[in-house]
């Protein structure tokens, strides 16, 4: 006998429409109804909703609302999770790494954790540790292969080894960054006595009996001499290695300095020679600046003269060079001896070699050359074309030849055409035209005609010009244009109104204002007429202010 | 490095049209012509025409009446039609690329292929 | 059309020696505005497509030994195989591209004496 299902308590989530539903239960085996899942609880399929099934062994999902645990709820300092899913459900499990120099509290390089019913089994952890270091004709004490932070490793010397004076055992801690040193022990008889002494010199430390080898010491030289060679001295195989010399520094003489003198120099000349290490003040000519770009500065004496050797370099100014075309954007007015200074070429110019920017060079007599910005062409778009040769760049005057696709030709009959690169930019385009787009002369109009002398053929998108003949008005676009072979709407030229003396009398009427005996007006023009002396008016008043209509103009009349 | 492969049938009917396409892999097919050049079996090479990637094409003038050359971009190929042909047209035909957008020479040459002309 | 004539029609020389080819166009192939010879030299052996040797007259392509060589300008042009070697023996074209249609000239045999 199928069982009916009771009304199914969902822990964590609900039956939807739990309450109209109730009374519906039992239900029988195959019914299935909608639920959903309170928050951090998901369906078995991973929704938020899915169905309850009553089957034959009652309700399923027999769990319908697992556990969710949120990867933004672990907090692994020194660690990452690199798995990619955000949400992990009830027993699902997530591996965790440390950083190099970090471990788990099982000293493992990764752990896991897993999604419990309360959340994370635990947070995860990964300590600072340190790797068994490599000992040096030593050993460990203990056996670990991880140490964590302030762990303390004690090792001890092999025989006739020894870590510092007379100890033959010593320790090592983990650090933040590491062991606080290695684990070395030195051959006994590789360590030094005090290191030898020198001439004119001494050591910066205060010597010791023993040295350890590799161990290094410094030496300084007294004043007025001059340290020659290596100024440390190391402890190997029981030995000291070459240590320096102190050599008496030489006077220097009175400096000549080109370009610029000493201060005070006539009261200075007779205090020369002067011993090493002196210094004195100068100033440089007008033109001419120390290295260090000032007008004046210090020259020393030193062991090998004076320094610095040229003690007043050649300057150069910005304002000395003319660049048409071109501009400097280097904000220093001022450049001295080898000094290199950019320019660049104005949008369409460049450098003789096509480049976009050139720099010249400040030397002894002055800027190495003027800059010169030369007028250049880009390669253009070709149209229905191709180039035939290769550059990137056209200086004025140059030529660039092209040819035409199959089917298209620049003018009647050519499928090849040259531009030249002048100072607005290329003559023109290099264009070809589908043939078959071309026109024929453009259509001959009734008192009118083209402005421009006819060719025989139009290239498309060519316009001409129409004009009437005097007193005609022009109707429609002056314009034509050539497209898909075939010209646009020419315009027409409209018949002028011809107000002739005949017609007047004829009416007994005359031109208000005006004595002239043939009048020409254009469409749209009015015309006032007014009776002849003696005459009165026979049609209305509106007559006689008549309107030229394409030729047509009807006179007033007077009795 | 640039691939050129001819593919066509081998075997044409007098009178009846000859269709090639030559399919470009491993390289940019855009920026350059890319040329139909023909040779008859013991003799020289013959420039067909070129065809570059926008559609534009130039003809030896004294096949152009019979030739139509196109591109196909979106699959990196271009073909070559041979209309009305005689025992005369027999040869291997080859796709090449000419190196730049001006005049220039052929520096990639697919392997060719051979078109007899029979009943 | 600009007509390719290259000289010899075939040429024997033996291993190690010299061989040069000539090729004449019947009009210049020198473009004023890039001072550059639009002349290229190919060789092409049994089966197999023609490959590209020389361009611009005496530029050597990419991975061509350099015994090979190209001179000439304007319409007299000469390929040069310093000292010759087995793997040489094929037919060498030159090729004009500076107008089209686009010409090579009629071949010429290289064979090892």
């Known amino acids: 006998e199928v069982k009916p299902c009771d009304f199914p308590e969902i822990q964590h989530g609900g039956l939807y429409y739990k309450s109209l539903r109730r009374l519906y239960f039992p239900a029988a085996a195959g019914q299935s109804y909608s639920y959903y899942c309170d928050q951090n609880f998901v369906t078995p399929s991973g929704s938020y909703w899915d169905y309850i099934h009553c089957t034959q062994d009652g309700w399923s999902p027999t769990v319908p609302c697992l556990r969710t645990c949120s990867k933004s709820d672990v907090e692994i300092e020194n660690g990452f999770i690199s798995e990619s899913s955000s949400i992990y459900i009830l027993n699902e499990e997530t591996q965790y790494n440390c950083k190099p120099g970090y471990a788990t509290a099982e000293g493992n390089s990764s752990g896991s954790i897993t999604c419990l019913q309360n959340g994370w089994s635990t947070q995860p952890i990964c300590i600072k540790f340190c790797d068994m270091p490599v000992f040096e004709n030593s050993r460990a004490k203990s056996n670990g292969m991880w140490f964590k932070l302030h762990d303390t490793l004690d090792y001890e010397c092999y025989d006739g080894y020894e870590s510092s004076y007379g100890n033959t055992t010593d320790s090592i801690v983990c650090g933040e960054d590491g062991w606080s040193h290695l684990p070395t022990c030195y051959n006994s008889s590789e360590n030094c006595g005090p290191p030898p002494p020198i001439s004119n010199g001494d050591t910066t430390s205060f010597p010791q009996k023993v040295y350890l080898p590799w161990s290094r010491v410094e030496y300084q030289c007294q004043s007025y001499y001059e340290l020659q060679g290596s100024k440390y001295v190391t402890c190997s195989n029981g030995d000291w290695s070459e240590p320096p010399r102190c050599i008496s520094m030489k006077p220097c003489e009175f400096p000549e300095i080109q370009h610029g003198h000493l201060y005070y120099e006539n009261t200075r000349r007779p205090y020369f020679p002067v011993a090493t290490g002196q210094s004195y003040s100068y100033y440089c000519d007008q033109n001419f600046v120390t290295p260090s770009g000032s007008y004046w500065d210090y020259i020393h004496c030193t062991q090998d003269g004076w320094l610095p050797t040229v003690p007043c370099l050649r300057t150069c100014s910005k304002s000395d060079i003319e660049i048409e075309n071109g501009f400097i954007s280097e904000s220093s007015s001022i450049y001295i001896l080898n000094k290199e200074i950019q320019y660049k070429c104005k949008p369409g110019y460049a450098t003789a070699d096509g480049n976009s920017s050139g720099s010249i060079t400040c030397l002894q007599n002055g800027w190495s050359a003027q800059p010169i910005c030369i007028k250049f062409c880009d390669m253009p778009v070709f149209e229905n074309s191709r180039a035939k040769s290769n550059g990137m760049r056209f200086k004025l005057h140059d030529t660039l030849d092209y040819e035409c696709y199959d089917g298209y030709e620049i003018s009647y009959g050519n499928t090849t055409g040259s531009i030249v690169c002048g100072e607005d930019g290329w003559s023109h385009f290099p264009t070809c035209y589908n043939s078959s787009e071309k026109c024929g002369p453009p259509p001959p109009i009734s008192n009118g005609d083209t402005t421009s002398f006819l060719l025989k053929v139009y290239v498309p998108q060519s316009r001409v010009e129409y004009q009437c003949q005097s007193y005609y008005e022009l109707q429609g676009s002056n314009y034509v244009t050539c497209s898909n072979g075939e010209w646009s709407e020419p315009p027409r030229c409209i018949h002028p109104c011809i107000i002739t003396e005949e017609n007047m009398n004829k009416n007994n009427i005359q031109l208000k204002g005006k004595s002239d005996i043939k009048y020409y007006a254009k469409t749209g023009d009015t015309i006032e007429f007014m009776c002849k002396l003696g005459y009165n008016a026979n049609t209305s008043v509106l007559s006689f202010q008549a309107v030229c209509r394409e030729g047509i103009v009807e006179y007033p009349r007077c009795e | 490095q640039v691939q050129l492969q001819e593919s066509g049938p081998g075997l044409v009917k007098p009178s009846e049209t000859m269709s090639l396409t030559c399919t470009v892999s491993?390289?940019?097919?855009?920026?350059?012509?890319w040329s139909w050049i023909r040779q008859p079996p013991g003799k020289g090479l013959e420039w067909i025409g070129y065809v570059h990637y926008s559609g534009g094409t130039k003809s030896n003038p004294s096949l152009k009446s019979r030739v139509t050359i196109s591109v196909d971009t979106s699959k990196n190929q271009f073909s070559l039609k041979l209309s009305s042909v005689t025992a005369a047209d027999t040869a291997v035909y080859y796709c090449a690329r000419e190196r730049y957008e001006w005049n220039s020479y052929f520096d990639y040459w697919g392997q060719g292929t051979l078109v007899t002309v029979s009943s | 059309d600009i007509v390719m004539t290259q000289s010899p029609d075939s040429l024997a020389v033996s291993l190690g020696e010299r061989a040069t080819i000539n090729c004449k166009s019947s009009q210049s192939v020198l473009y004023s505005s890039n001072n550059k010879n639009y002349l290229a030299w190919y060789h092409q052996k049994p089966g197999q497509p023609p490959k590209l040797l020389i361009y611009w007259a005496s530029t050597r392509e990419s991975g061509v030994p350099d015994r090979f060589s190209g001179s000439g300008s304007g319409t007299d042009f000469t390929l040069t195989i310093s000292s010759l070697q087995a793997e040489d023996v094929a037919v060498y074209y030159c090729?004009?591209?500076?107008?089209?249609?686009?010409?090579f000239g009629q071949g010429t045999k290289v064979e090892i004496k």
């Open positions: 491993g390289g940019s097919f855009t920026g350059y012509y």
């Open positions: 090729q004009q591209y500076y107008s089209s249609p686009r010409t």
